[in-house]
């Protein structure tokens, strides 16, 4: 058993049929010694008396809010949550496996630049009685500070018969050094509580590996005289790190016909313009990637040819 | 050229070669981003290789103030990785494929380090500890981790030379 926060405790249980459970001793936070009784949740049934209460925690029915009273007055509370371990593996019932980039990916994180700011998100099908708390650091043995905000519900989607909820959180490294080469990964830890079930999820990454620039901005076409060719130009996204002579991007320009089956013409360039042939009903798209480190491409910015 | 007295390197040449190094480092291990590299022992390997750190003067302001600190740091790292790529971690069994870019990567590391420090000029003798012997099964993982770290190292070096070529070239 360990304390998650004031008056909230997590009991770690090996979860299998007829498991013996864990013996837990609760102590009433009071100077009083006599006349103390204990109850669980809203029930008025007295579970025991005295300053301490010993219970055997085996299942969710044994978890909940234990309250000690004296003469009708509440003295203190202890909320017990359960953390299940099945076949040596902690349960992951609350969050959905996103399976990208690999199985058992519950948290996904992205950064728009090298400033030390990043966003993580996760999915669940649970709609109520759900709380999250997020902590982060750079490195684990001698952790350096990363400040995370509160997790918020960022999207709701219908997937077949189920509703899916996306939560996200923004974090910022306290003393980020955008130009340096990271040697210690960022660690992100999410505590999830659904009713009386506790679970924790972690992710470890370098900012450089989760970089995904915003799409190029101000994408424009300039027809060239007496030619089917056009000059496409664009700019670095506002959110990208500066100076651009140091934090450089490379770009992919794509000409795509109306039909998905039509052949795509692609040009790669380090410049912020390119000359391409504009076919009728086609569209021109441009995306960006860090020039020197192969992290994710941005989403496409597109304009129609006509 | 970046010589101990402090004259400028051939920024544009360094830019071109460092960008080539980035391409080679990724073609030597393209699937790197899809593998989980935080298995047991990874911290030791990443701690053992050079890193361009915050105080090394490789940020735009530091380069403007005095690029020599950063260039020396990059030079040290290039020599270090060149020695690793020339060691039996890469030359021993299992043999690399004949068309593996590791050979080109090794040569390019040496080439860039020589651009930074031509014959007759010396920063300091490059010291590298004895390498631990490795078995074939260990080499595959070590190669992966070294190339992974090298990708990050040369990315920073390439940014430095690109910025230098754009803003510090005579």
């Amino acid at each position: 058993i360990w304390e998650l926060k004031k008056d909230v405790y997590v009991v770690e249980l090996d979860w299998y049929p007829d498991a013996p459970g864990e013996m837990v001793v609760l102590t009433c936070d009071t100077p009083e010694e006599d006349g103390i009784t204990w109850t669980l949740d809203q029930s008025s049934e007295v579970l025991g008396s005295g300053k301490t209460l010993t219970i055997q925690v085996k299942e969710f029915g044994d978890a909940g809010q234990y309250t000690c009273h004296k003469g009708g007055e509440v003295l203190s509370h202890s909320l017990l949550l359960l953390h299940k371990k099945e076949d040596g593996i902690w349960s992951t019932d609350i969050l959905k496996d996103q399976k990208e980039p690999k199985n058992k990916t519950f948290l996904r994180c992205e950064a728009k630049n090298y400033s030390g700011r990043f966003t993580c998100w996760w999915l669940t099908t649970i709609s109520t009685d759900l709380t999250f708390s997020v902590k982060s650091s750079r490195g684990s043995s001698d952790p350096q500070g990363v400040t995370c905000g509160a997790a918020t519900l960022s999207a709701e989607r219908v997937r077949g018969d189920n509703k899916e909820y996306e939560y996200s959180v923004e974090c910022q490294e306290d003393s980020a050094c955008p130009a340096a080469e990271e040697s210690l990964p960022i660690e992100v830890m999410v505590d999830a509580v659904h009713k009386l079930k506790y679970e924790n999820y972690t992710s470890s990454f370098f900012i450089r590996d989760i970089i995904k620039p915003d799409p190029p901005k101000n994408l424009q076409l300039k027809p060239l005289k007496n030619s089917r060719q056009v000059e496409v130009s664009w700019e670095y996204p506002d959110t990208w790190s500066t100076p651009h002579s140091y934090f450089s991007l490379t770009f992919c320009v794509q000409v795509q016909g109306k039909s998905k089956r039509e052949k795509k013409d692609r040009v790669f360039t380090d410049k912020t313009s390119a000359t391409v042939i504009c076919r009728k009903n086609a569209s021109i798209s441009v995306r960006a990637q860090d020039r020197y480190y192969s992290s994710s491409w941005s989403e496409w910015a597109s304009v129609p040819c006509s | 050229r970046a010589v101990p007295g402090g004259s400028s390197p051939a920024w544009t040449q360094c830019q071109q070669l460092s960008q080539k190094l980035c391409t080679l480092a990724w073609s030597a291990h393209p699937l790197v981003g899809h593998m989980d590299l935080r298995e047991e022992g990874d911290e030791e390997t990443t701690n053992d290789v050079p890193h361009i750190q915050c105080g090394d003067g490789c940020d735009p302001q530091g380069l403007r103030d005095n690029s020599q600190f950063c260039l020396q740091r990059i030079h040290q790292g290039l020599i270090f990785y060149e020695k690793l790529l020339g060691s039996d971690i890469f030359t021993g069994e299992p043999s690399l494929l004949p068309d593996s870019p590791v050979g080109q990567l090794h040569a390019s590391l040496l080439g860039l380090s020589q651009l930074l420090q031509p014959e007759g000029h010396h920063w300091e003798t490059q010291q590298i500890p004895s390498l631990s012997p490795s078995q074939p099964w260990q080499r595959l993982l070590l190669r992966f981790k070294i190339l992974r770290s090298l990708q990050a190292f040369v990315a920073v070096a390439a940014r430095v030379f690109a910025h230098g070529a754009a803003t510090l070239s005579p």
């Epitope: - | 500890p129 631990s132 070294i146």
Partner: antibody, heavy 120, light 113 residues
């Protein structure tokens, strides 16, 4: 928890072979090299040799012709053999471990040591 | 072989006073690439096996009191104890693991005055 335990005869006759065993627990043999170090009574520490995680060995040049280090991974045991011993080989013999990495590491855990006396 | 020269060989100290031990290898232990010094400090208490105090010249092993600190680089290293306590008595050794064979200093015997 991490443990290394040396064992073997406390008395060996001159010209014979000293044989010691180091039994380890609490760590993965894939991740740690195991070393032998000795300390003559009232003197300093001398490195004897190492068996690397991959099974290869390196020995102190001053002892190389007489030393063999081997292992039995199924039993989590490492052995030291030192042939043609003399009174100068009387010492406390320790086994210790270091984390396998690109470069040789430092010894973070040691056994409690076993005294071997060479005498007829 | 790299020769490790430790001084002093004997160090009588009054409890509460600082103590300092020097270790000078015959060649640099600094790896210029990764800026690590391949030097460790050990304390061997009477009748016990050596215990790791400091690694990479200046990183304190977990559980080691913060009165112990290591400094130096290349060919000149120092172990300092800010305020000596009775339990610090024993022999202190430096170890180089830059090249085979690993070599130790001769040891410094710290005793309470």
């Amino acid at each position: 928890q991490v443990q290394l335990q040396e064992s073997g005869p406390g008395l060996v006759k001159p010209s014979e072979t000293l044989s010691l065993t180091c039994t380890v627990s609490g760590f993965s043999l894939i991740s740690y090299n195991v070393h032998w170090i000795r300390q003559p009574p009232g003197k300093g520490l001398e490195w004897i040799g190492v068996i690397w995680t991959g099974g290869s060995t390196d020995y102190n040049p001053s002892l190389k012709s007489r030393v063999t280090i081997s292992r039995d991974t199924s039993k989590n045991q490492f052995s030291l053999k030192l042939s043609s011993v003399t009174a100068a080989d009387t010492a406390v013999y320790y086994c210790a471990r270091d984390k396998y990495g690109l470069f040789p590491g430092y010894f973070d855990y040691w056994g409690q040591g076993t005294l071997v006396t060479v005498s007829s | 072989d790299i020769v490790m020269t430790q001084t002093p060989l004997s160090l009588p100290v009054t409890p509460g006073e600082p103590a300092s031990i020097s270790c000078k290898p015959s060649q640099s232990l600094l790896s210029s690439g990764n800026r690590k010094n391949y030097l460790a400090w050990y304390l061997q208490k009477p009748g016990q096996s050596p215990q790791l105090l400091i690694y990479y010249a200046s990183t304190r092993q977990s559980g080691v009191p913060d009165r112990f600190s290591g400094s130096g680089s290349g060919t000149d290293f120092t172990l300092k104890i800010s305020r000596v306590e009775a339990e610090d008595v024993g022999v202190y050794y430096c170890l180089q693991h830059f090249n085979y064979p690993w070599t130790f200093g001769q040891g410094t015997k710290l005793e309470i005055k």
